[in-house]
């Protein structure tokens, strides 16, 4: 049984809480890396691929060394929500063209959702200010062609990979300061 009603909950160990978030982030990063390798193998596409609807890479928000935990978690959650939306859009819009990647894309979506829930939990446990609900984002336009969709897939996975690296580096750095 839990503590008696009215007794204060044991305060969480912030390092342990942060650590489990880092682990989920690293696991998702590895999934993303493997999927990116598969995508490049099956649908080679040279050069950088951009998608205007994707979040600006968090890295440009400032040097990692100067970041604080609330700003990292807030920014990460906002960016990952956007990537979740883009992965869902990609699976809907490109179902047939990307069917060779489908089981992995589905797993990626599930794990992205799990990390988002973990971030939400971490923010509440560390008593960080909760964000207001996101306003509904405008729907993403379907890709103009199969090739356009493949380029979008490269942009989404590439951006997610870099965002997760930024997150792992930032969270581990912050953990050393706790």
């Amino acid at each position: 049984p839990g503590p008696p009603p009215g007794s204060p909950r044991a305060s969480p160990d912030p390092r342990a809480e942060l650590d489990s978030t880092v682990l989920l982030t690293r696991s998702l990063l590895e999934d993303t890396r493997q999927l990116t390798i598969q995508l490049k193998d099956k649908f080679p596409a040279d050069g950088d691929h951009n998608l205007d609807s994707l979040p600006t890479l968090a890295m440009s928000a400032g040097a990692l060394g100067a970041l604080q935990l609330p700003s990292v978690l807030t920014r990460l959650r906002a960016d990952l929500l956007s990537y979740l939306r883009h992965v869902q859009w990609l699976r809907r819009a490109m179902g047939s063209s990307l069917k060779t990647l489908e089981p992995e894309l589905g797993t990626l979506q599930t794990r992205l959702d799990r990390l988002l829930r973990r971030l939400q939990l971490l923010m509440s446990r560390l008593a960080l200010p909760q964000l207001p609900p996101d306003p509904p984002a405008p729907p993403l336009a379907p890709p103009s062609s199969t090739w356009g969709g493949i380029r979008a897939a490269h942009a989404i996975l590439g951006g997610l990979h870099l965002t997760l690296d930024w997150a792992v580096r930032g969270l581990l750095l912050l953990k050393t300061r706790l």
Partner: antibody
Framework: EVQLVQSGAEVKKPGASVKISCKAS????????MDWVKQAPGQRLEWIGD????????IYNQKFTGRATLTVDKSASTAYMELSSLRSEDTAVYYC????????????WGQGTTVTVSS | DIVLTQSPASLALSPGERATLSCRAS??????????IHWYQQKPGQAPRLLIY???NLASGVPARFSGSGSGTDFTLTISSLEEEDFATYYC?????????FGQGTKLEIK
């Protein structure tokens, strides 16, 4: 062929600074982090820090914070490490190494740059 | 910081023999399916070369006689049948937390 080519050996006086370059070729520079590792005679390898060429600034081993500065020139696929306020303990071989995103294992290394600090 | 201790400090074996090198971490470097330990080989005057990453994955171009195993705090690099070119110093490294740290090395010498 994937390779990292570092600048040549340096001899410096105590208190001076040194800046080492590391030119990457054979891969997409922004797909990996660039890490720097120190190997002093008779000492363990020591991680100095890393930088993601996409931006956002480097992260450092606390031991080197304030003295090491990592930068990149994305257009030239080149990374730099500057070490200031040199002392005799900084005499070592310094390596740049390509780091897998989020994992800190180093699959490609530069040939090393020997820095000697002596009065 | 996590401290990695390698043993033995040096090992003398003959070509064709099996080599077993050990690396012990001061705290667990394994979590949820991953062990954040990596192995390198270094020869005099050369840069280190990645052999094994994430405890058991063979790096590109590394011969299959090299293998890595272990979890938690205890890890092993095994060379199944030593070749002349395998005599070198071997380092383990962790990436569980920041900063990544290296072991002090095991020197493998020809008997």
């Amino acid at each position: 062929e994937v390779q990292l080519v570092q600048s040549g050996a340096e001899v410096k006086k105590p208190g001076a600074s040194v800046k080492i370059s590391c030119k990457a070729s054979g891969y997409t520079f922004t797909d990996y982090n660039m890490d720097w590792v120190k190997q002093a005679p008779g000492q363990r390898l020591e991680w100095i820090g890393d930088i993601n060429p996409h931006g956002g600034g480097p992260i450092y081993n606390q031991k080197f914070t304030g003295r090491a500065t990592l930068t990149v020139d994305k257009s030239a696929s080149t990374a730099y490490m500057e070490l200031s306020s040199l002392r005799s303990e900084d005499t070592a071989v310094y390596y740049c190494a390509r780091g897998e995103l989020g994992h800190w294992y180093f699959d490609v290394w530069g040939q090393g740059t020997t820095v000697t600090v002596s009065s | 910081d996590i401290v990695l201790t390698q043993s033995p400090a040096s090992l003398a074996l003959s070509p064709g023999e099996r080599a077993t090198l050990s690396c012990r971490a001061s705290k667990s470097v394994s979590t949820s399916g991953y062990s954040y330990i990596h192995w390198y080989q270094q020869k005099p005057g050369q840069a280190p070369r990645l052999l094994i990453y994430l405890a058991s994955n063979l790096a590109s171009g590394v011969p299959a006689r090299f293998s890595g195993s272990g979890s938690g705090t205890d890890f092993t690099l095994t060379i199944s049948s030593l070749e002349e070119e395998d005599f070198a110093t071997y380092y383990c490294q962790h990436s569980r937390d920041l900063p990544p740290t290296f072991g002090q090395g095991t020197k493998l010498e020809i008997k």
